[in-house]
């Protein structure tokens, strides 16, 4: 079968892996700084702790964080900032073992959202100085334009 122009058109993709994670002194939050591992298209721009949406549309978002923390529950929030607002798109929560040798849980979640041009997406861990494993196969963030 002959592919139409629409079928040939490739979806924008951005898969990000962590550079580091930081927590400001006056903050109860840990943020992850990202770098692209796989990129196709120009609709998404990684910038430090966030990803800026250049092309509005419907996206599949996925997020995983690997925690090595004995705090009773850990998890991440995928947050959008746009139109002056900040809002949670989705969150993931895990109970953690209290013993340091066993406190090793990953948290994965995903969803489909309409994102607007200029929106900035980030992964927030609502804990100060959260202990994360920043290996690229344990902690990552991704976008696929549908």
């Amino acid at each position: 079968a002959v592919l139409t122009q629409k079928q040939k058109k490739q979806h924008s993709v951005l898969h990000l892996v962590p550079i580091n994670a930081t927590s400001k002194d006056d903050s109860d939050v840990t943020e992850v700084m990202w770098q692209p591992a796989l990129r196709r298209g120009r609709g998404l721009q990684a910038q430090g702790y966030g990803v800026r949406i250049q092309d509005a549309g419907v996206y599949l978002l996925y997020s995983q964080v690997l925690f090595q923390d004995v705090t009773f529950t850990m998890g991440q929030v995928v947050s959008r900032e746009g139109q002056g607002r900040q809002e949670t798109l989705f969150r993931c929560i895990r109970s953690m073992p209290s013993h340091p040798d066993r406190a090793y849980n990953s948290c994965y979640s995903a969803g489909v959202f309409h994102l607007h041009q200029g929106d900035i997406l980030s992964v927030i861990i609502p804990r100060a100085r959260a202990k994360l494993n920043l290996s690229p196969h344990g902690t990552f963030l991704g976008f696929v334009k549908l």
Partner: antibody, heavy 122, light 108 residues
Framework: QVTLKESGPGILQPSQTLSLTCSFS??????????VGWIRQPSGKGLEWLAH???????YYNTALKSRLTISKDTSNNQVFLKIASVDTADTATYYC??????????????WGQGTSVTVSS | QIVLTQSPAIMSTSPGEKVTLTCSAS???????LYWYQQKPGSSPKLWIY???NLASGVPARFSGSGSGTSYSLTISSMEAEDAASYFC?????????FGAGTKLELK
């Protein structure tokens, strides 16, 4: 229990800088999804949003007033500040600060201070 | 910016009557980000309704909100004396956030 309280000079002269302080308790500006905004209301009139600041220090300003406004925070002392430069009589109003409970889809300016009255007069 | 027009500016009503206040937007507003505030003389505004139809904590069940797109309303099923106040609609669908000029609801 969430409370906010505004303080300001009461009266000032045209061309001076208005400095306002919002002191709050019952929440922290170091928490994800929390912000504080400033809104003003001339006597007998409607509400006008001026500026707001988020937990991560991101700041937003009323476009028409942006060149005159500066918002900042002191997280450890639970305070947010607003400065308005070069005031004139049109800035006479009651100034409110309000907590913005962000993070969720159903958030809003859910708690307001009692307001502080500011008169600009020569 | 989105302009919110509230009507009527002033409304007088008797206890027990049904009251509907309207808020018209100059362009479409997402119902998620449409709010109503109540303000009584000498007091600060109180969040009354959020996300178009959800009542804030402590708001009596006689209040309701509805609407979509550019047309929103606040309804009181049976007016009571304590409902006399000004009501402001507010949108944060689009930046900057804006307020309507308000409707003053008086008791006859």
């Amino acid at each position: 229990q969430v409370t906010l309280k505004e303080s300001g000079p009461g009266i000032l002269q045209p061309s001076q800088t208005l400095s306002l302080t919002c002191s709050f308790s019952g929440f922290s500006l170091s928490t994800y999804g929390i912000g504080v905004g400033w809104i003003r209301q001339p006597s007998g009139k409607g509400l006008e949003w001026l500026a707001h600041i988020w937990w991560n220090d991101n700041k937003y300003y009323n476009t028409a007033l942006k060149s005159r406004l500066t918002i900042s925070k002191d997280t450890s002392n639970n305070q947010v500040f607003l400065k308005i430069a070069s005031v004139d009589t049109a800035d006479t109003a009651t100034y409110y600060c309000a907590r913005i409970a962000g993070g969720n889809y159903d958030y809003a300016m859910d708690h307001w201070g009692q307001g502080t009255s500011v008169t600009v007069s020569s | 910016q989105i302009v919110l027009t509230q009507s009527p500016a002033i409304m007088s009503t008797s206890p027990g009557e049904k009251v509907t206040l309207t808020c018209s937007a100059s362009s479409s507003v997402s119902s998620t980000y449409l709010y109503w505030y109540q303000q009584k003389p000498g007091s600060s505004p109180k969040l009354w309704i959020y996300s178009t139809s959800n009542l804030a904590s402590g708001v009596p069940a006689r209040f309701s909100g509805s609407g979509s797109g550019t047309s929103y309303s606040l309804t009181i099923s049976s007016m009571e004396a304590e409902d006399a106040a000004s009501y402001f609609c507010h949108q944060w669908s689009s930046y900057p956030p804006t307020f309507g000029a308000g409707t003053k609801l008086e008791l006859k």
